[in-house]
Every structure is written in structure tokens, then in C-alpha cells.
């Protein structure tokens, strides 16, 4: 299953990055799981994940660094709390969980650049 996502995104000065993850038509998929993975070398670490149904909105865990909304076969993802050290390749993985058959697809990744804000100069 094809998954598309932007090649590059620049995080805001507040450390927030948003991008759209779009997957090949879900057909009759009723339950979809979206996972954001960070790739560092050959290592993949899970940043956040959410399962949503066609009946409900996308819902990440309350303590997640991600938020998102879903519309059809598009998911608008927002990652918060990013710092310069978090700069890297973020891959969107989509699983069509139910009903069968199971499909999985992974995007090529979005390179997120994070620049820590300059500290404000002291004012006399």
C-alpha cells in the first residue's frame, strides 16, 4: 500500500512540526493504525501511534507528543516538543487493521529540521 508524505518540513520556533500522511485508498477499511517512526541510521524508534475508525476521530494517547486529525485517507499529524537534537527522518506507517485483509505501508519519510530558538539577550 502506497503512503505519501512530504520530503521536508521545518519545525516552528516553538518546536512544532506538522505534515500530512496520505495512504492509498482504504477501500472499506474501518480501523486504521497510524504510527510515526523516527529513523536514526538503521534504528527505528516509535514516536507515537494512534488507531482510529471511520466512525471516530483520530485519538492519540493523552500523554503523546503527537496530535492529529483524520479525513478519509489523509491524516494530519502534528509533533510537539521538538528540539534541535530531534532533527531527523520521520516515517509514517499506516496499517489497515480491519476488516481483513490486513494491509501495511510506509512512507519514504519526512526530514524534520528543528532549530532551537536563540536565547533572548538580557535587557538592562
Amino acid at each position: 500500500m502506497h503512503v505519501a508524505q512530504p520530503a521536508v518540513v521545518l519545525a516552528s520556533s516553538r518546536g512544532v512540526a506538522s505534515f500530512v500522511c496520505e495512504y492509498g485508498s482504504s477501500g472499506n477499511a474501518a480501523e486504521v493504525r497510524v504510527t510515526v517512526l523516527r529513523q536514526a541510521g538503521s534504528q527505528m524508534t516509535e514516536v507515537c501511534a494512534a488507531t482510529y475508525t471511520v466512525e471516530d476521530e483520530l485519538a492519540f494517547l493523552d500523554d503523546s507528543t503527537c496530535t492529529g486529525t483524520s479525513s478519509g485517507n489523509k491524516v494530519n499529524l502534528t509533533i510537539q516538543g521538538l528540539r534541535a537534537m530531534d532533527t531527523g527522518l520521520y516515517i509514517c506507517k499506516v496499517e489497515l487493521m480491519y476488516p481483513p485483509p490486513y494491509y501495511v505501508g510506509m512512507g519514504n519519510g519526512t526530514q524534520i529540521y528543528v532549530i532551537d530558538p536563540e536565547p533572548c539577550p538580557d535587557s538592562d
Epitope: 485508498s25 482504504s26 477501500g27 472499506n28 474501518a30 480501523e31 493504525r33 488507531t51 475508525t53 471511520v54 466512525e55 496499517e95 487493521m97 480491519y98 476488516p99 481483513p100 490486513y102
Partner: antibody, heavy 116, light 112 residues
Framework: EIQLVQSGGDLVKPGGSVRLSCKAS????????MNWVKQAPGKGLQWMGW????????TYADDFKGRFTFSLDNAKNTAYLQINSLRAEDTAVYFC?????????WGQGTTLTVSS | DIVMTQTPLSLSVSPGEPASISCRSS???????????LEWYQQKPGQSPKLLIY???NRFSGVPDRFSGSGSGTDFTLRISRVEADDAGVYYC?????????FGGGTKLEIK
């Protein structure tokens, strides 16, 4: 308002054929699977199978392989159940039902009577 | 195929009293994603079934909180905390985890 309106039930002689219709409205037809459920007189519900309204791929329960065919007319937002070589035991109410992770919407049912 | 066995076949309950229906599957109905697609439906004579509970314990919108579902693996229960006259009908469990999906045989609830 989401609705599934069924038609096509009739009195048919054994050996004949029938096509039952299920017309959907109020939602995007190709986003949800359409299921068919049989209820013989005085009996319980029996899952017949479902058709993927996006790909057109049907899945049949074992008891409904062979004489039964699910089909679609996406332009009309309609699902069909065709039954060939009708037998007395096909006498039943047939329901269509829209499924996501459950069946919130059902047709009103259509009665098929097979008798000579 | 997974067989869903409901007990009792019928029960008669006075208004205000609790009612409980059991549904047992012939094998686990946990789907590969960890979810259990076990539902409960109510059907009244001449009507289409109505969804009460999905994924074992989630009440469908508009269903009174007198209805609750529980269970795991192969054993599931529908409970009505205080039966009302309008609850009369046949109740079916359904598993949508493993194809072919299957209904239980039904339990007829009569109000005394």
C-alpha cells in the same frame, strides 16, 4: 439521514432465480462493506457474507457458496444479492447491513418465499 | 468455523429485575490486532436487529446505560441491570473477528 432500502422479495417457484436489492443513501457508499444476513422463518440470524464496495470483492460463508452472488452498482449506490436454483429452504427474510467495526445500519429486510 | 453458543435459550424477567445472557465462542475471538469484535444485537418481531454493544463492552450511541457487556477470550455476557417492558425481544451475540463471521443462536427475553 443514512438509509438502506431493500426490495425484490417475492414468491418464486423452486428452480427459479431472484435478485434482491439494497439501495444506500446518506453516506459514501464505497467507504463501507455491505453484508447480507439471512433469517429463516422462526429462526435466528445467519451471516451470509459481505462485499467490499470499493473493490467489488465478495466473501461468502460456506453455506452460501455456489448459488449466491453479491454484486454492486456503485453508480446507483446499490448492492445486490442474486440467488439461483431456488429451493424451499431459501425461504427467509434477507437483510443487508452496513459494516464498519459493527452494524449500526440495517435494511428493513425483504421476504423471499420459494414455493410451487 | 467459530460457533457462538448462547445461554439460556429464553428467560422471563420481571420489570426492574436484572437479566444476564451468556455467549461462548468455540475458540478465541481475539483478532490479530488485539481487538475483540464481539457485538450484541436486539431484535423485535418484524423489525431489523439493533446494535447494543460493540467490541465486547462499548455501548452504541443512544443505548441506555442499563445495558452493559463484558468478557474476554471465549466467554462474554450481556447484562441488563433493570429490565423494562420495552426490552422484550431476541438478543444475538455476533463475532466479527474471524471469517466466516457468525451469530449466536439467540436468546428470547420475555417480560413477566
Amino acid at each position: 439521514e443514512i438509509q438502506l432500502v431493500q426490495s425484490g422479495g417475492d414468491l418464486v417457484k423452486p428452480g427459479g432465480s431472484v435478485r434482491l436489492s439494497c439501495k444506500a443513501s446518506g453516506y459514501t457508499f464505497t467507504n463501507y462493506g455491505m453484508n447480507w444476513v439471512k433469517q429463516a422463518p422462526g429462526k435466528g440470524l445467519q451471516w451470509m457474507g459481505w462485499i467490499n464496495t470499493y473493490t467489488g470483492e465478495p466473501t461468502y460463508a460456506d453455506d452460501f457458496k455456489g448459488r449466491f452472488t453479491f454484486s454492486l452498482d456503485n453508480a446507483k449506490n446499490t448492492a445486490y444479492l442474486q440467488i439461483n436454483s431456488l429451493r424451499a429452504e431459501d425461504t427467509a427474510v434477507y437483510f443487508c447491513a452496513r459494516r464498519s467495526i459493527y452494524y449500526p445500519y440495517w435494511g428493513q429486510g425483504t421476504t423471499l418465499t420459494v414455493s410451487s | 468455523d467459530i460457533v457462538m453458543t448462547q445461554t439460556p435459550l429464553s428467560l422471563s424477567v420481571s420489570p426492574g429485575e436484572p437479566a444476564s445472557i451468556s455467549c461462548r465462542s468455540s475458540q478465541s475471538i481475539v483478532y490479530s490486532n488485539g481487538n475483540t469484535y464481539l457485538e450484541w444485537y436486539q431484535q423485535k418481531p418484524g423489525q431489523s436487529p439493533k446494535l447494543l454493544i460493540y467490541k465486547v463492552s462499548n455501548r452504541f450511541s443512544g443505548v441506555p446505560d442499563r445495558f452493559s457487556g463484558s468478557g474476554s477470550g471465549t466467554d462474554f455476557t450481556l447484562r441488563i441491570s433493570r429490565v423494562e417492558a420495552d426490552d422484550a425481544g431476541v438478543y444475538y451475540c455476533f463475532q466479527g473477528s474471524h471469517v466466516p463471521w457468525t451469530f449466536g443462536g439467540g436468546t428470547k427475553l420475555e417480560i413477566k
